[in-house]
C-alpha cells in the first residue's frame, strides 16, 4: 500500500521581499526519503530540480535553491513539489517573491521571522 505523502513546505531566506541584485534562497521541505525536490514557477513548465537533499530534522529532509542576484524577472509565485518513489507529492502553497527596486527603501523583511538559518545554497540555471 502506497503511503500518503505530506505536502511540502516552502520558505525563503532572508525573506520574501528582496532588493534588486541581492540573493534569495528558497527552502523546500518534505519527509525523509525524498529523491528529488522541484522548485516551480507559476507555470509548471518552468522548474529547477535538485537531488542534493539533507536532513532538516530526524523526520524531515530539505533542499535549497539559491538565486545569487535577483532581478525583476525573478518576482512572482514559487512552489515546491517532490518525488518520493513511486510518486510525486502535491504542490506546496505558493510563496510570492517581491523584488524591491534600487530607489525604494529596503524592506524590513517582515515576512521572514520564521525562516531557518541559511546554509548558502545556490540554484543553477534558475529562470
Amino acid at each position: 500500500q502506497e503511503e500518503d505523502l505530506p505536502r511540502p513546505s516552502i520558505s525563503a531566506e532572508p525573506g520574501t521581499v528582496i532588493p534588486l541584485g541581492s540573493h534569495v534562497t528558497f527552502v523546500c521541505r518534505g519527509p525523509v526519503g525524498v529523491q528529488t525536490f522541484r522548485l516551480e514557477r507559476e507555470s509548471r513548465s518552468t522548474y529547477n530540480d535538485t537531488e542534493d537533499v539533507s536532513q532538516a530534522s530526524p523526520s524531515e529532509s530539505e533542499a535549497r535553491f539559491r538565486i545569487d542576484s535577483v532581478s525583476e524577472g525573478n518576482a512572482g509565485p514559487y512552489r515546491c513539489i517532490y518525488y518520493k518513489p513511486p510518486k510525486w507529492s502535491e504542490q506546496s502553497d505558493y510563496l510570492e517573491l517581491l523584488v524591491k527596486g534600487p530607489t525604494q527603501r529596503p524592506s524590513d523583511n517582515s515576512h521572514n521571522e520564521h525562516a531557518p538559518a541559511s546554509q548558502g545554497l545556490k540554484a543553477e540555471h534558475l529562470y
Epitope: 525523509v32 537531488e51 542534493d52 536532513q55 530526524p58 533542499a63 539559491r66 546554509q119 548558502g120 545556490k122
Partner: antibody, heavy 119, light 107 residues
Framework: EVQLVETGGGLVQPKGSLKLSCAAS????????MNWVRQAPGKGLEWVAR??????????FYADSVKDRFTISRDDSQSMLYLQMNNLKTDDTAMYYC??????????WGQGTPVTVSA | DIQMTQSPASQSASLGESVTITCLAS??????LGWYRQKPGKSPQLLIY???SLADGVPSRFSGSGSGTKFSFKISSLQAEDFVIYYC?????????FGSGTKLEIK
C-alpha cells in the same frame, strides 16, 4: 546507466600525495552531492568526505581521520569528482569508492580504486 | 559522533530461512538509515533507504523497519547470493557512520 569510474590509485610512500579521480556519467552530475568512502583490506566501510552542489556553495565535510590532509572537489562541467590526498599514512591503505548521493543516501557506487601506502 | 552498533557480527542460516539484523544508533536519527550489502570483491549496494524504503531493483524479500535509535533489517526466504556482508549506515549527521557489518554464512 549510471557509471562512476575511479582512477588514480596506486602505491605511494608515507607522507606522499595522491589524487583520485571519478568520472561520472548517466545522470545529471551537478544536482547531486558526492562522496568518497573507503574500505581497508578485510575491514568495514568508512565514510571519508562529502561535497554538496553549487546550490550549497560546494560545502565540504570530512571524517576526522582525514581532515586537513584530504581535499574533496568537483568539476561539474566535466562531471568529475576528485580527492586530493596529502601526508598519507599507512592507515590510509584502502579501496576508495566514489559514491553518488540520492535522497541523502549512498545510491550508486563506483568499482573502487586501490591505494596502498607503504615504505 | 553517532555510533552505529550492528549485531550480530556473523550469523549462520539455511537456504529458505529468514534472518534479522539489528542496528542501534547512539542518538536519535529518525529514519535517516540505510542498509547495504557487499558481495566479495564488489562494491556495496544500497538495499534500503530511509529505514524502510526499498531501493530500485531490490527484491521484496528484503525489508527494513524502525526509527529513532533502533532499526531492523530482514531477509525472508534466503537465497544463495544472500550469504554476504551487510552494513547499516546513519546519514543524519556528519561524520556519516557505518555499522561494523554482519557476515551471513550458509549453515
Amino acid at each position: 546507466e549510471v557509471q562512476l569510474v575511479e582512477t588514480g590509485g596506486g602505491l605511494v610512500q608515507p607522507k606522499g600525495s595522491l589524487k583520485l579521480s571519478c568520472a561520472a556519467s548517466g545522470f545529471t552530475f551537478n544536482i547531486n552531492a558526492m562522496n568518497w568512502v573507503r574500505q581497508a583490506p578485510g575491514k568495514g566501510l568508512e565514510w571519508v568526505a562529502r561535497i554538496r552542489t553549487k546550490n550549497n556553495n560546494y560545502a565540504t565535510f570530512y571524517a576526522d581521520s582525514v581532515k586537513d590532509r584530504f581535499t574533496i572537489s568537483r568539476d561539474d562541467s566535466q562531471s568529475m569528482l576528485y580527492l586530493q590526498m596529502n601526508n598519507l599514512k599507512t592507515d590510509d591503505t584502502a579501496m576508495y569508492y566514489c559514491v553518488r548521493d540520492r535522497a541523502g543516501f549512498f545510491a550508486y557506487w563506483g568499482q573502487g580504486t586501490p591505494v596502498t601506502v607503504s615504505a | 559522533d553517532i555510533q552505529m552498533t550492528q549485531s550480530p557480527a556473523s550469523q549462520s542460516a539455511s537456504l529458505g530461512e529468514s534472518v534479522t539484523i539489528t542496528c542501534l544508533a547512539s542518538q536519535t536519527i529518525g529514519t535517516w538509515l540505510g542498509w547495504y550489502r557487499q558481495k566479495p570483491g564488489k562494491s556495496p549496494q544500497l538495499l534500503i533507504y530511509a529505514a524502510t524504503s526499498l531501493a530500485d531493483g531490490v527484491p521484496s524479500r528484503f525489508s527494513g523497519s524502525g526509527s529513532g535509535t533502533k532499526f531492523s533489517f530482514k531477509i525472508s526466504s534466503l537465497q544463495a547470493e544472500d550469504f554476504v556482508i551487510y552494513y547499516c549506515q546513519q546519514l543524519y549527521s556528519t561524520p556519516l557512520t557505518f555499522g561494523s557489518g554482519t557476515k551471513l554464512e550458509i549453515k
